[in-house]
Structure formats: structure tokens, C-alpha cells
């Protein structure tokens, strides 16, 4: 779990190793100087972009080695009791629709990343949040309309998907169906939350990969 101290440290990207090296170099040169993080990130990003494939190779090797370490450690890692593997997700199940904010982020993330290349994923997300909060309700409307349409489509698709998956459900009694409805809805809410987290994780991973490509 998130709080498990025994859980192997996450694998680092080549760019992360490069930034770490930059930090160490900076500390050696200026041991007492405080670091302006956004300036430092920007400089790192600019340096990374101008580096040759050969120069990046060293960091890529470090990332490969760290990936191997992570995979090796994960094989022997036993999660704490009660922390079970996520339930199986049917790849054919309709994908949960994005929220209005998620759609908005897809529009404006390139702008923020383009204008502030050194920003971390967290800072990009923070800036997007600020932009969304400062956007007038009517400027949010197109995203909200699209999200509502996608939600409607998802609800139809998921109903069809469930009906297809349980052809004998109709034969069961109405009373039993009503009883289980509330429990089912609670389960669905949990699933939805998991899906949302997963989508965010996937996006973060994609962004890390983008950083690697820079």
C-alpha cells in the first residue's frame, strides 16, 4: 500500500536520474545556496533537451538498471494483509467517461507544458486546477456538456454490457433485485473511484514518458 515502508521504491525514469545528478552537482558547487525549484527545473529541462543521445545513454542505463531492480524487488514483495490485488477489469467493459475538468485539462495541458517545460506533473496539475477555478461558468459549459453526453452514453453502454453479461438476471425476482440494487450501487461507486484513480495514474505515466522523450 501507499504507507507500506517495505514496499520497493518506485522505478526512476532516465530524466529523473538526470535531475538527481543535476541537483547533486548544484549542491557541490553551491552548498549553502537555496534552490529556486521552478528555475532549477526549467534549466534542467533545457539542458536535457539539448543533450545528445550518447549523453542521455548513461541515464537511460541507470533507468534500465533501476527498472530491473524494481521488478526484482516486486517479485518478492508481499503486500500487507487486507491489501488485495485490484479486481479483474474486463477490457471490453465500457470505459468510464471523463469529467468536464478532465476534458478541460486535455485542452490546456499542452499550453502549460509548452510554456513551462520544467514544471513537474504535480505543478502542471496545480496550474490546471487554478485555470479551471478561474474560468467563468459559461466557459466551462462546453466541457460540461460534452462530459454529460459522454456520461449518458457510458450509462447506456454499461447497462447494455451488464445485460449482456447476465442474461438470466431478468428471470430473478424483483424483490431480490431491489435488495441488491443499493449494494450494487455502492460497489459501482467504489469501482468508479478506482477507475478515476487509474486514469489519473495512466496520465501521469504518459506524462513521465513525455518527459523522457524530451
Amino acid at each position: 500500500g501507499k504507507g507500506d515502508p517495505k514496499k520497493p521504491r518506485g522505478k526512476m525514469s532516465s530524466y529523473a536520474f538526470f535531475v538527481q545528478t543535476c541537483r547533486e552537482e548544484h549542491k557541490k558547487k553551491h552548498p549553502d545556496a537555496s534552490v529556486n525549484f521552478s528555475e532549477f527545473s526549467k534549466k534542467c529541462s533545457e539542458r536535457w533537451k539539448t543533450m545528445s543521445a550518447k549523453e542521455k545513454g548513461k541515464f537511460e542505463d541507470m533507468a534500465k538498471a533501476d527498472k530491473a531492480r524494481y521488478e526484482r524487488e516486486m517479485k518478492t514483495y508481499i503486500p500487507p494483509k487486507g491489501e488485495t490485488k485490484k479486481k479483474f477489469k474486463d477490457p471490453n467493459a465500457p470505459k468510464r467517461p471523463p469529467s468536464a475538468f478532465f476534458l478541460f485539462c486535455s485542452e490546456y495541458r499542452p499550453k502549460i507544458k509548452g510554456e513551462h517545460p520544467g514544471l513537474s506533473i504535480g505543478d502542471v496539475a496545480k496550474k490546471l486546477g487554478e485555470m479551471w477555478n478561474n474560468t467563468a461558468a459559461d466557459d466551462k459549459q462546453p466541457y460540461e456538456k460534452k462530459a454529460a453526453k459522454l456520461k449518458e452514453k457510458y450509462e447506456k453502454d454499461i447497462a447494455a454490457y451488464r445485460a449482456k453479461g447476465k442474461p438470466d438476471a431478468a428471470k430473478k425476482g424483483v424483490v431480490k433485485a431491489e435488495k441488491s440494487k443499493k449494494k450494487k450501487e455502492e460497489e459501482e461507486d467504489e469501482e468508479d473511484e478506482e477507475d478515476e484513480e487509474e486514469e489519473e495514474d495512466e496520465e501521469d505515466e504518459e506524462e513521465e514518458e513525455d518527459d523522457d522523450d524530451e
Epitope: 476534458l103 486535455s106 499550453k111 509548452g114 479551471w132 478561474n134 474560468t135 467563468a136 459559461d138 466557459d139
Partner: antibody
Framework: EVQLLESGGGLVQPGGSLRLSCAAS????????MTWVRQAPGKGLEWVSS????????IYADSAKGRFTISRDNSKNTLYLQMNSLRAEDTAVYYC????????????WGQGTLVTVSS | DIQMTQSPGTLSLSPGERATLSCRAS???????VAWYQHKPGQAPRLLIH???TRATGIPVRFSGSGSGTDFTLTIATLEPEDFAVYYC?????????FGQGTKLEIK
């Protein structure tokens, strides 16, 4: 330097069509929400339509709904306004403008192109 | 739709004087969504103020915006010859995004 250059205006008969273009330069076009604003002779400014950075989201004034279509080609750094079923009251100078951040207020404008609807 | 009414329609002043332009909204607005523009004949409109009081990039400090609710003001502290133009207020809190009819600032 940010530049917006409108073209495609001219004289058209009522019921006719016209396609306005706005060529953008000096900034990363695909990052910005863009808009069309018009000014009828002797009148004030009137917002017409706006489009999101990717072109996936559009919004129109009631006077433009169903007749005008805003679009963009990010590979060509160009904004468009397709105007159909034109009426005399559509006669105006049409400006394209760039939205600052995500708000519907505009920090850079073109010089405008005149559309005259008359028989 | 939110109507924006500007007053006066025309303001005749001399360079060096202070100009106060008013804008009234037909319903209460958050100042966050009010902008002011300057427009000269044959030129592109120019954004002066957004968010009610934030000066746009490159706008001289003599221009300032204030107000809340339904009443908003653009003040030009000391008029320069190049400031004579038409000024528009705009609300962008709800669509349609509406402008005032404009205030013409002319040389006395």
C-alpha cells in the same frame, strides 16, 4: 510578435455564404482559445463565436447559432468562420482575436475584414 | 443576456486631465469577469484591463479599473494625446459575452 490577419470579407447577397479566415503568427496557435467578434457600422462590438485550443469545443452567440460555424486548422495556424444564410444585419467588420488564458476576453485582435450583405 | 451600459456616451477632455468612464451591468457581476478595451478607427481593439482591475501586458499605469456588483469604472489618471479613442467595457462571466455601447473620449 503576435499577429492576426483576417481575410475573406466582401460583398455578398442576402442568403449567400462567405468563409472568413484568420492567419495567426508569432505564438503557438494550438495553445489558445480563439474567437470572432464583429462590429456593425456605427455600432459597438458584438461577440460571435469562440473555439477551444484543439477545436473540440465551440460556443456561439444566438445570432450565429445554426448559420455560422467556427473551426480551426492548427497545422495551418488558421481560424475560420463559415457564414451561411447571410442577412443584412450581418454586415459588419469581423475581427478574430486570441483569448488570454481560458477566459472569454481577448488580448490580441486582428485589424478586421469587412463583410457587406446587400442586394 | 446581461446588458452593459456605458456613460457618458461622449467625454470631452484635454490632455493632462483625469478621465472617469462608467459601466453598469444589468445584473450583479463578479469583478473577476469584467474587461476594458480601447478602440481607434481602422485599428485592432486593445485589451486594457481584465479581471476588473488587472492591467494587461504593456498597458501604462495611468489606466486603472475598479468596481464590483453592477458598477465598474475605468480611470485614466492623466490623459495623453494617444488616449483619445472609444472605450468598451465587457462582461465575460456568462454567454453571450456582452460589451457596452462604448464611450467616445474626444479632445476638448
Amino acid at each position: 510578435e503576435v499577429q492576426l490577419l483576417e481575410s475573406g470579407g466582401g460583398l455578398v447577397q442576402p442568403g449567400g455564404s462567405l468563409r472568413l479566415s484568420c492567419a495567426a503568427s508569432g505564438f503557438t496557435f494550438s495553445y489558445y482559445m480563439m474567437t470572432w467578434v464583429r462590429q456593425a457600422p456605427g455600432k459597438g462590438l458584438e461577440w460571435v463565436s469562440s473555439i477551444s485550443p484543439s477545436g473540440g469545443y465551440t460556443i456561439y452567440a444566438d445570432s450565429a447559432k445554426g448559420r455560422f460555424t467556427i473551426s480551426r486548422d492548427n497545422s495551418k495556424n488558421t481560424l475560420y468562420l463559415q457564414m451561411n444564410s447571410l442577412r443584412a444585419e450581418d454586415t459588419a467588420v469581423y475581427y478574430c482575436a486570441r483569448a488570454l488564458s481560458t477566459g472569454s476576453f481577448w488580448d490580441y485582435w486582428g485589424q478586421g475584414t469587412l463583410v457587406t450583405v446587400s442586394s | 443576456d446581461i446588458q452593459m451600459t456605458q456613460s457618458p456616451g461622449t467625454l470631452s477632455l484635454s490632455p493632462g486631465e483625469r478621465a472617469t468612464l462608467s459601466c453598469r451591468a444589468s445584473e450583479s457581476l463578479t469583478s473577476t469577469y469584467v474587461a476594458w478595451y480601447q478602440h481607434k478607427p481602422g485599428q485592432a481593439p486593445r485589451l486594457l484591463i481584465h479581471g476588473g482591475s488587472t492591467r494587461a501586458t504593456g498597458i501604462p499605469v495611468r489606466f486603472s479599473g475598479s468596481g464590483s456588483g453592477t458598477d465598474f469604472t475605468l480611470t485614466i489618471a492623466t490623459l495623453e494625446p494617444e488616449d483619445f479613442a472609444v472605450y468598451y467595457c465587457q462582461q465575460y462571466g456568462s454567454s453571450p459575452y456582452t460589451f457596452g455601447q462604448g464611450t467616445k473620449l474626444e479632445i476638448k
